[in-house]
């Protein structure tokens, strides 16, 4: 999906109002400095591409974050503010339901969510140059 035509300001507002709190809840006191940031993004569409990938695609050591509250709210925000996004996700959602597993918060998942927080920061502060 091409995120170029999304309403970035509305997505930013959704992050700051709810998604950020759900990510912090998931991290449960784990500090962002406890992990190295290995994923980055260069502009807002790129950030959303990386956010979608880390949020919804299973990775080694972290089977699925897609059923977490922050993921569901991310999905809703993208569906509302990115034209045509929901249509592209129907097949992916059906496949994900077949793979659904018991939720376990592993250290790898905490690291992945920490990466997500970094990507969201970059999305929300696109004009701030990386130091």
């Amino acid at each position: 999906y091409d995120f170029t035509n999304c309403d970035f300001e509305k997505i930013k507002a959704a992050y700051l109002s709810t998604i950020s709190k759900d990510l912090i809840t998931y991290m449960s006191g784990t500090k962002s400095t406890e992990f190295n940031n290995t994923v980055s993004c260069s502009n807002r569409p790129h950030c959303l591409t990386e956010i979608q990938s880390l949020t919804f695609n299973p990775t080694a050591g972290c089977a699925s974050l897609a059923k977490e509250m922050f993921a569901m709210k991310t999905k809703a925000a993208l569906a509302i503010w990115c034209p045509g996004y929901s249509e592209t996700q129907i097949n992916a959602t059906q496949a994900m339901k077949k793979r659904r597993k018991r939720k376990v918060t592993t250290n790898k998942c905490l690291e992945q969510v920490s990466q997500l927080q970094g990507l969201w920061r970059r999305f929300n502060r696109p004009l701030l140059k990386q130091q």
Epitope: L16, S20, S32, T33, N37, R121, Q131
Partner: antibody, heavy 123, light 112 residues
Framework: QVQLQESGPGLVKPSGTLSLTCAVS?????????WSWVRQPPGKGLEWIGE???????NYNPSLKSRVTLSVDTSKNQFSLRLSSVTAADTAVYYC????????????????WGQGTLVIVSS | DIVMTQSPLSLPVTPGEPASISCRSS???????????LDWYLQKPGQSPQLLIC???DRASGVPDRFSGSGSGTDFTLKISRVEAEDVGVYYC?????????FGQGTKLEIK
């Protein structure tokens, strides 16, 4: 608004145990904050003692770790400091402080402090 | 532990004039996320410390814009563009990259 209030004895005997409590109002101690203790000897600088999360997870300053115990009481919305085997060098103003997360999971910002309580170690 | 060193330790300033305080850390405070975990606090006489700047350059809520933080890695600066009488007190830098959090020795700003 968020307020923190330290309480405890102002005088402790050498080799005794210093015990302080920080009562939190305007915020739930079970929110996603770390809660710290910082001390300041008279006329000197600030020293971080340690921190506790509502789950009971702790981080301590290694220089004090063998003598410090932090605890949290979510039902009373307060957290406590115990410092054992005290000497005159532990005489200081003791502050409790809130370390609230940023929108991106950053910690390390003490945005609210108690007014401090002076503890003197003397016989 | 990360050692924080401030200079000068004493800073007499005329009201309306600028002021600058330096803080140096024994190791880099720049995280891989691109942010510096360095705070500035002001402790006014007889009061508790108050947060001025976090992440090296982000002003805390309610802090006047005459205060600004800059720097990266191991060298940081707090600038006051025009000192006011209410700015007197001791300024501390603190590293928040790792525990134990450590403070600089403090810089006492006084009015000439």
């Amino acid at each position: 608004q968020v307020q923190l209030q330290e309480s405890g004895p102002g005088l402790v005997k050498p080799s005794g145990t210093l015990s302080l409590t920080c009562a939190v109002s305007g915020d739930s101690i079970s929110n996603y904050n770390w809660w710290s203790w910082v001390r300041q000897p008279p006329g000197k600088g600030l020293e971080w003692i340690g921190e506790i999360y509502h789950s009971g997870r702790t981080n301590y300053n290694p220089s004090l770790k063998s003598r410090v115990t932090l605890s949290v009481d979510t039902s009373k919305n307060q957290f406590s400091l115990r410092l054992s085997s005290v000497t005159a060098a532990d005489t200081a103003v003791y502050y409790c402080a809130r370390d609230a997360p940023s929108d991106y999971g950053d910690y390390g910002f003490f945005d609210h402090w108690g007014q401090g309580t002076l503890v003197i170690v003397s016989s | 532990d990360i050692v924080m060193t401030q200079s000068p330790l004493s800073l007499p300033v005329t009201p309306g004039e600028p002021a600058s305080i330096s803080c140096r850390s024994s190791q880099s405070l720049l995280h891989s996320n691109g942010y510096n975990y360095l705070d500035w606090y002001l402790q006014k006489p007889g009061q508790s410390p108050q947060l001025l700047i976090c992440l090296g350059s982000d002003r805390a809520s309610g802090v006047p814009d005459r205060f600004s933080g800059s720097g990266s890695g191991t060298d940081f600066t707090l600038k006051i563009s025009r000192v006011e009488a209410e700015d007197v007190g001791v300024y501390y830098c603190m590293q928040a990259l790792q525990t134990p959090y450590t403070f600089g020795q403090g810089t006492k700003l006084e009015i000439k």
